[in-house]
Interface confidence: low
């Protein structure tokens, strides 16, 4: 039975040209995390594997940095980075947990962070 929940940074906004940390946290389970995939729509951004460590997709290597922790840092943001991001936790023995973050990249300098929320 899957008992865990994923807490994410929720709906967030950031300035064009700036950077942002996408963060997910798996709680309420003792399951072992074997791999975390970070995806944007259908594109794989990065993998953090418990044995292999981090891999960043070649097309994002210049703008994506691993961490902190199992999170992901996006740099040199453009308006095209606006959209949904998913953290996909592969765990044993529970299975797969998915968290969703919506990022809005703003032209103006007034970029405010949205509230945190939980995804069961």
């Amino acid at each position: 039975m899957m008992t865990g929940t994923i807490e994410t940074t929720g709906n967030i906004s950031a300035e064009k040209g700036g950077s942002i940390i996408l963060q997910c946290h798996l709680s309420s389970t003792t399951a072992q995390v074997t791999q975390v995939n970070w995806e944007q729509q259908d594109q794989l951004l990065a993998i953090c594997n418990a044995d292999l460590g981090w891999h960043i997709s070649p097309s994002f290597k210049d703008r994506v940095a691993p961490g902190p922790g199992l999170g992901l840092t996006l740099q040199s943001l453009t308006v095209n980075d606006t959209g949904e991001y998913f953290c996909i936790y592969h765990t044993y023995p529970d299975g797969t947990y998915t968290g969703r973050i919506f990022l809005e990249v703003l032209e103006s300098s007034v970029a405010e962070h949205g509230a945190r929320f939980q995804i069961p």
Epitope: T34, Q35, L44, I47, L52, S57, P58, H90, Y92, P93
Partner: antibody, heavy 119, light 105 residues
């Protein structure tokens, strides 16, 4: 139906090269790692390496680095094992196999292809 | 690197008997996987993450264990069960045990 169909095996002279192909169907090719495993005559299974076709990340057995290269063509849903500087001891049946997401077991296997290195 | 050692190398048993195959890891692991291979065929996933039966695998197969010691049990042997069995894990690459050949006594 999820399937992996292999091709490219055969007889090659020592020092020669060979490229094995593994054509995937029945699932989203870019979402799963594909591994290569070999089995020498009468022996057990030996992991060669694997690839995540969605981004071409590869993970290889140190034993084969420098001689064997794994690649994938997303447009063809096909993974490849390029083998160079082949030796007699590389004679084996080579299998490609899909890895289950996040658990690292081989859930679907190709039929295998025999590579014979002999003069 | 973690080494998987399977025992016995060959197990002779009769139809209807219970068969127990062992896989020992050189250091503690979270789980292992089991495969069955028949002559001239590719290996087939039998049990994943220690105790979960792969799709289509009969319930006479079961897996157990933790830490360094894992077991594959076949409760009542049938003719099609005589094959070679391999355990496997992933630690910075896949490792396989040397296999146990299950033959008819």
């Amino acid at each position: 139906e999820v399937q992996l169909v292999q091709s490219g095996g055969g007889l090659v002279k020592p020092g020669g090269s060979l490229r094995l192909s593994c054509a995937a169907s029945g699932y989203t090719f870019t979402n799963y790692w594909i591994g290569w495993v070999r089995q020498t005559p009468g022996k057990g299974l030996e992991w060669v390496g694997d690839i995540y076709p969605g981004s071409s990340f590869t993970n290889s057995n140190e034993k084969f680095k420098g001689r064997f290269t794994i690649s994938a063509d997303k447009s063809k849903n096909t993974a490849y094992l390029q083998m160079n500087s082949l030796r007699a001891e590389d004679t084996a049946v080579y299998y490609c196999a899909r890895l289950g997401r996040g658990y690292w077991y081989f859930d679907v296997w190709g039929q295998g292809t025999l590579v014979t290195v002999s003069s | 690197d973690i080494v998987l050692t399977q025992s016995p190398a060959t197990l002779s048993a009769s139809l209807g008997e219970r068969a127990t195959l062992s896989c020992s890891a050189s250091s503690s692991v979270s789980y292992i996987h089991w495969y069955q291979q028949k002559p001239g065929q590719a290996p087939k996933l039998l049990i994943y993450t220690t105790s979960n039966l792969a799709s289509g695998v009969p319930s006479r197969f079961s897996g157990s264990g933790s830490g360094t010691d894992f077991t594959l049990t076949i409760s009542s042997l049938e003719a099609e069960d005589f094959a070679t069995y391999y355990c496997q894990l992933f630690r910075s690459g896949s490792a396989f045990g040397g296999g146990t050949k299950l033959e008819i006594k």
